[in-house]
């Protein structure tokens, strides 16, 4: 092949630097963004996926940008502008991140955002035949109304004082308040 | 520390309306069981009126005699109103809000109670 | 449901013991939904008794409540000035629908 540095091989400003041994008369250093023996083949440096949590890769030749979606930033949109970090749920909830927002996973009984809010577990009327629902701090409890019993007053008790149950909870008499 | 404060209160004429407010601090309707409001006649005794689910069902109880010229709602998770329409002097009365809460096995049990506000109906 | 207090006024003097008795026109709920305020001029009545026996929080064992179905009673022991006040019994019931109502009250004169 015979060619050296002197007859100017390597491409796109490329660094010809002369072979250490006869079979290599000349290495070309690339500069970023290029590559192959001459420096002849553009990099893809989108493929490389640099842009994380799904931003949108733009190689513009002298330089590569990520365009960012919504609730993340940084040149490669490593930041999540409202993650976990720094971001505390409350009443023992846990944190868990997605989709460019936080989302607190609630511990049983509460809600809301950050878990800073009371659950209510009688707002789907859960006490049966006139029951009376009372958030309670194991949940709920129902007031049965006279005649029924169960933990949601679906169980009419018989004239005779039995229960449409199996057998009764033991403890429990018709119409107690439920657990 | 918990509280509830009514207010609303004052002169109204006979057949006027009012409403009347009660507002909660240091706890929230919604972790309790329901809101209710008694009134006290001047020197006589105490009389239920009406109570409201804490919760989002909104569910109302009212005495017998104060179905249609009373109602009860929560406007917040704070705040609880009693409308009064066509009010007689017999409507004068100290008007206090009070919370009602499961205890062993029983209801209405109002462990929590505002100081009241004066309602006075006259011409 | 009518709820009768007797007797007022009761009157007792400083460490004695006043009783007072709540009958109620019917059973309340559950035989023991019943609860005693204490009320004193210009202040909020204040729970001392539910589920007919039980002592609230923060209320002196000198008050005992006890009864069921439609007889019910108010003990206090050991008065002190501070007692004087009017005592309400409280029943609940249902009839097709949840309610609840006050006896009379009774005033209690600590002499």
């Known amino acids: 092949s015979g060619v050296t540095c002197a007859d100017g091989p390597c491409f796109n400003g490329g660094l010809c630097v002369g072979g250490a041994d006869p079979d290599s008369a000349y290495i070309c250093h690339c500069p970023p963004g290029f590559q192959g023996s001459n420096c002849e083949k553009r990099v893809d440096r989108c493929s490389l996926q640099p842009c994380r949590n799904g931003g949108l890769c733009l190689d513009l030749g002298h330089a590569l940008r990520c365009r960012c979606r919504a609730g993340f930033a940084g040149p490669r949109c490593e930041h999540d502008l409202d993650d976990c970090a720094g971001r505390a749920c409350a009443n023992g909830g846990t944190c868990v991140e997605g989709g460019g927002a936080h989302r607190c996973s609630c511990a049983l009984g509460f809600g809301g955002r950050d878990c800073r809010e009371r659950a209510d577990p009688c707002a789907a009327r859960p006490c049966a035949h006139g029951g009376r629902c009372y958030a309670h701090f194991s949940g709920l409890v129902c007031a049965c109304a006279p005649g029924y019993m169960g933990a949601r007053c679906e169980f009419p008790v018989h004239p005779d004082g039995a229960s449409a149950l199996p057998a009764a909870p033991p403890g429990l008499r018709p119409g107690d308040p439920q657990r | 520390q918990e509280q509830l404060v009514e207010s609303g209160g004052g002169l109204v004429q006979p057949e006027g309306s009012l409403t009347l407010t009660c507002t909660a601090s240091?706890?929230?309707?919604?972790?309790?069981?329901?809101m209710c409001w008694v009134r006290q006649a001047p020197g006589k005794g105490l009389e239920w009126i009406a109570c409201?689910?804490?919760?989002?069902?909104?569910?109302t109880d009212y005495a017998n005699w104060a179905k249609g010229r009373f109602s009860i709602s929560k406007t917040s998770s704070t705040t609880v109103t009693l409308q009064m329409t066509s009010l007689t002097v017999a409507d004068t009365a100290t008007y206090f809000c009070?919370?009602?809460?499961?205890?062993?096995?029983?209801?209405?049990?109002?462990?929590?109670w505002g100081p009241g506000t004066l309602v006075t109906v006259s011409s | 449901q009518v709820l009768t207090q007797t007797p007022s006024p009761v009157s007792a003097a400083v460490g004695g013991t006043v009783t007072i008795s709540c009958q109620a026109s019917?059973?309340?709920?559950?035989?023991?939904?019943l609860a005693w305020y204490q009320q004193k001029p210009g202040q909020p009545p204040k729970l001392l008794i539910y589920?007919?026996?039980s002592l609230a929080s923060g209320v002196p064992s000198r008050f005992k409540g006890s009864g069921a179905g439609t007889q019910f009673t108010l003990t206090i022991s050991d008065l002190e000035c501070d007692d004087a006040a009017t005592y309400y019994c409280?029943?609940?019931?249902?009839?097709?629908?949840?309610?609840?109502?006050f006896g009379g009250g009774t005033e209690v004169v600590v002499k």
């Open positions: 409280q029943g609940t019931y249902y009839s097709s629908g949840w309610y609840s109502t």
């Open positions: 589920a007919a026996s």
């Open positions: 240091g706890f929230s309707f919604s972790s309790s069981g329901y």
């Open positions: 009070a919370r009602d809460v499961y205890i062993d096995s029983t209801i209405f049990n109002f462990n929590l």
């Open positions: 409201i689910s804490g919760g989002s069902s909104g569910d």
């Open positions: 019917q059973s309340v709920y559950n035989n023991n939904n």
